[in-house]
């Protein structure tokens, strides 16, 4: 929270590679590489939907929706097991995210 | 979307008191959410925050003085036992890794004898 | 324990530029967040990340940071910008997380 950015300066992350394809099932599933300089005490995760440094903390507990995932205006929760997250839009369409 | 605080009041020292913030137009499950005060005449002091999984910090002055806690629309600060230096206006604010872009109008806590 | 620090007062005449400071050993790696508060009323958020606006905040409004030193800058002062002037950042991280406020900078325009 509130670290700065810059040229990948410590607690930063930028992206290098974002792919969209689509599966048989029409279903499409966005890849998305980051590259993390992340301090002590942090560790790469997602912050508004983008890649971003969070407290190592929030990964180890699977507190998922610490990391403020979801965009402004949707709702986040956890999935069975802790196994990722869904952010829900105020229109009702929920985007699911797992993490393996 | 707004915040608004409540429970504020003329308390003696040493009687807990709680405050209650309430959210409407938004979910509290993608925001932080924070305490600050304002004693009469001074600074904005910041108390403590809530993650959406209910985990908290604190100011290292407000440890032990102060306990943060969360329901699905609220969130509440109590004040364990009250010393006449908390006499203060009450803000909660919303949080991300913005800043604190919301805030509530404020509630009065007096604290004498 | 982290220390924001700000002048108590600053003057400035009806619609010249004022700049004021806020300084810190951490705000070379962290953001520094930039609040209005007018008597009576609750803090608005300004500047957050040294530099961004929210939207409605006037562009009269714009904030830097350089090394140790974040700076929040006026143009064309307005009678309605006499205010107390709050940066604000925060440190650490896991059990160690705090945010914290300068002292404030009550500005006054003549």
């Known amino acids: 929270q509130f670290l700065k950015e810059g040229q990948l300066a410590a607690g930063t992350c930028e992206i290098v590679t974002l792919d969209r394809c689509c599966n048989k099932n029409r279903r499409t599933i966005a890849r998305q590489t980051a590259r993390c300089a992340c301090r002590k005490g942090q560790i790469a995760g997602t912050t508004r939907a983008r890649p971003a440094c969070v407290d190592a903390r929030i990964i180890k507990t699977k507190q998922w929706c610490d990391m403020l995932p979801c965009l402004e205006g949707e709702g986040c929760d956890l999935l069975i097991n802790r196994s990722g997250w869904t952010c829900t839009q105020p229109g009702g369409r929920i985007k699911t995210t797992t993490v393996s | 979307q707004s915040l608004e605080e409540s429970g504020g009041r003329l308390v003696t020292p040493g009687t807990p008191l709680t405050l209650t913030c309430t959210a409407s137009g938004f979910s509290l499950s993608t925001y932080y959410m924070s305490w600050v005060r304002q004693a009469p005449g001074k600074g904005l002091e910041w108390i403590g925050i809530v993650y959406p999984s209910g985990t908290t910090y604190y100011a290292n002055w407000a440890k032990g003085r102060f306990t943060i806690s969360t329901a699905s629309t609220t969130v509440d600060l109590m004040i364990t036992s009250p010393t006449t230096e908390d006499t203060a206006t009450y803000f909660c604010?919303?949080?991300?890794?913005f800043g604190y872009g919301l805030w509530g109008p404020g509630t009065l806590v007096t604290v004498s004898s | 324990e982290l220390v924001l620090t700000q002048s108590p007062s600053v003057q400035v005449n009806l619609g010249q530029t004022v700049s004021l400071t806020c300084t810190a050993d951490?705000?070379?790696?962290?953001?520094a967040s930039w609040y209005q508060q007018k008597p009576g009323q609750a803090p608005v958020l300004l500047i957050y990340r040294d530099t961004s606006r929210p939207s409605g905040v006037p562009d009269r409004f714009s904030g830097s940071s350089s090394g140790n030193t974040a700076t929040l800058t006026i143009s064309g002062a307005q009678a309605g910008d006499e205010a107390d002037y709050y940066c604000?950042?925060?440190?650490?991280?896991?059990?160690?997380?705090?945010?914290?406020f300068g002292g404030g900078t009550q500005l006054t325009v003549t």
């Open positions: 604010a919303r949080g991300d890794s």
């Open positions: 604000a950042t925060s440190d650490g991280s896991g059990s160690n997380y705090q945010y914290v």
């Open positions: 951490t705000l070379s790696r962290s953001y």
